[in-house]
């Protein structure tokens, strides 16, 4: 029972995580205009992996896609790649884990096969989560670097009374969604891997009882298993399951108004 719960919970957590990774990848708010030094702007800029947007205080929003591929920064391309790899791995992991779920019976699939599938999906979820976390972290690092660079150049080009204020960008909502989603996918993957250990057919050691018969050196093993020759051998014997229900003995593992002066 505990294994089923762990597996089910791992699946649900991973599902939420992958949905979050997809949402984060599609979101436009990866970086948002920093308003700390400029709270009075009537034009708000924000950017995503695929397009940049401008929201005017009049309520109109205009978004423009990045229609170039070669002209984009290598880091942005890398983040895109990481997020897409994360989504693809996660999606495949979800597909595999559906068939691996203990509560779903498909033909006469053995528990060993389900265990392998559970482990495979678990590893996929872990890698998917790591890809998302890495992608978001790379983007965040890029923002931090650019933020301090633009701060250093904040008032370059000042001439007389004229100020040219450079737009600075800070962390957008998508980064936090991505971090949380990546973490959930990672946790879900770990849970699937834990569940896999409980699903795998148990390997029990049976101590051999030796009977010394005259002229033979045969070790007899209790439990209906075929006797193996060789005195005192510590052979591991596998139980044979009939595909029926089996009891589990594993421990169960268990979220305006504005005034401008």
């Amino acid at each position: 029972m505990a294994v089923t719960a762990c597996q089910g919970l791992g699946f649900v957590v991973s599902l939420i995580g992958i949905a979050g990774i997809i949402a984060a990848t599609c979101m436009d708010q990866w970086s948002t205009q920093d308003l700390y030094n400029n709270p009075v702007t009537a034009v708000f800029n924000y950017q995503g992996l695929w397009r940049s947007c401008v929201r005017e205080s009049s309520g109109f929003t205009e978004c423009r896609g990045y229609f170039t591929l070669l002209g984009l920064p290598a880091m942005l391309q890398a983040v895109r790649a990481l997020m897409i790899v994360g989504i693809v791995l996660g999606a495949i992991g979800l597909l595999v884990s559906i068939f691996a779920l203990k509560c779903i019976r498909i033909g006469s699939m053995e528990d060993s096969a389900k265990a392998n599938m559970t482990l495979t999906s678990g590893i996929m979820f872990i890698v998917s989560g790591l890809c998302a976390i890495a992608g978001v972290s790379v983007f965040a690092n890029m923002l931090v670097t650019n933020f301090w660079m633009s701060t250093a150049n904040m008032y370059t080009g000042m001439g007389g009374m004229v100020q040219t204020v450079q737009t600075r960008y800070t962390f957008g909502a998508a980064l936090f969604v991505g971090w949380v989603a990546g973490g959930l996918t990672l946790i879900g993957g770990v849970m699937m891997c834990i569940a896999c250990r409980g699903l795998a057919p148990e390997e029990t050691n049976y101590k051999a009882v030796s009977y010394h018969a005259s002229g033979h050196s045969v070790a007899y093993k209790p439990g209906g298993f075929k006797a193996s020759t060789g005195f005192g051998s510590n052979t591991k014997n596998k139980k044979i399951y009939d595909g029926g229900a089996r009891t589990e003995d594993e421990v169960q593992s268990y979220p305006s108004k504005h005034d401008y002066v």
Epitope: Q33, V40, T41, A42, V43, N45, Y46, Q47, S52, C53, V54, E56, S57, S58, G59, F60, E62, R64, V162, Q163, T164, V165, Q166, T167, S256, K257, H258, Y260
Partner: antibody
Framework: QVQLQQSGAELVRPGSSVKISCKAS????????MNWVKQRPGQGLEWIGQ????????TYNGKFKGQATLTADKSSSTVYMQLSSLTSEDSAVYFC???????????WGQGTSVTVSS | DIVMTQSPSSLSVSAGEKVTMSCKSS????????????LAWYQQKPGQPPKLLIY???TRESGVPDRFTGSGSGTDFTLTISSVRAEDLAVYYC?????????FGSGTKLEIK
Amino acid sequence: QVQLQQSGAELVRPGSSVKISCKASGYAFSSYWMNWVKQRPGQGLEWIGQIYPGNGDTTYNGKFKGQATLTADKSSSTVYMQLSSLTSEDSAVYFCARFVKGNAMDYWGQGTSVTVSS
Amino acid sequence: DIVMTQSPSSLSVSAGEKVTMSCKSSQSLLNSGNQKNYLAWYQQKPGQPPKLLIYGASTRESGVPDRFTGSGSGTDFTLTISSVRAEDLAVYYCQNDHYYPFTFGSGTKLEIK
């Protein structure tokens, strides 16, 4: 067509308050911010503030904060501006204007003249 | 607050002539996000409310004659009337649309000789 109809001229005493209105028609009233602009006789234009009738959000020019209060009534498609503690400096023509793409004001009311005199 | 400085304060021209008026802002009105300048031009005829002519520094409002042209970027902007007509007698205001509070220039009064 879009129309902004403002209330008539007001003659008020210093220290008193006045509430002027701007009735909108010909467009989705709740979807556009409404601005208020002040113009003293023979002088330039001064932005007072704006209100979003959809949810009542307001943004004020710090100079007018506390003196001007903007409200909106969706049922009658009307925005109001109340001016309190009036002085002779507040004698002016007040315009309401719809806020559109580009942060520009495309349609304006005909103006309401407020005269503060004892 | 952003200071909008218009020049000249008034000018007198004959019908058919080309007119150019200037507007300077104390801070750049160019938005890096969409490379648009948030500046508008208004025309106010005597006894009337202002009328929007140009927004985004160069986009002509629908219904505005094509003799009115807006240009410029950053802090320096220009309104040009290619061939002045008698009905163009008015005060022309530029307005900062980028930063709160929205501020207007003091205006350029156009008179027809």
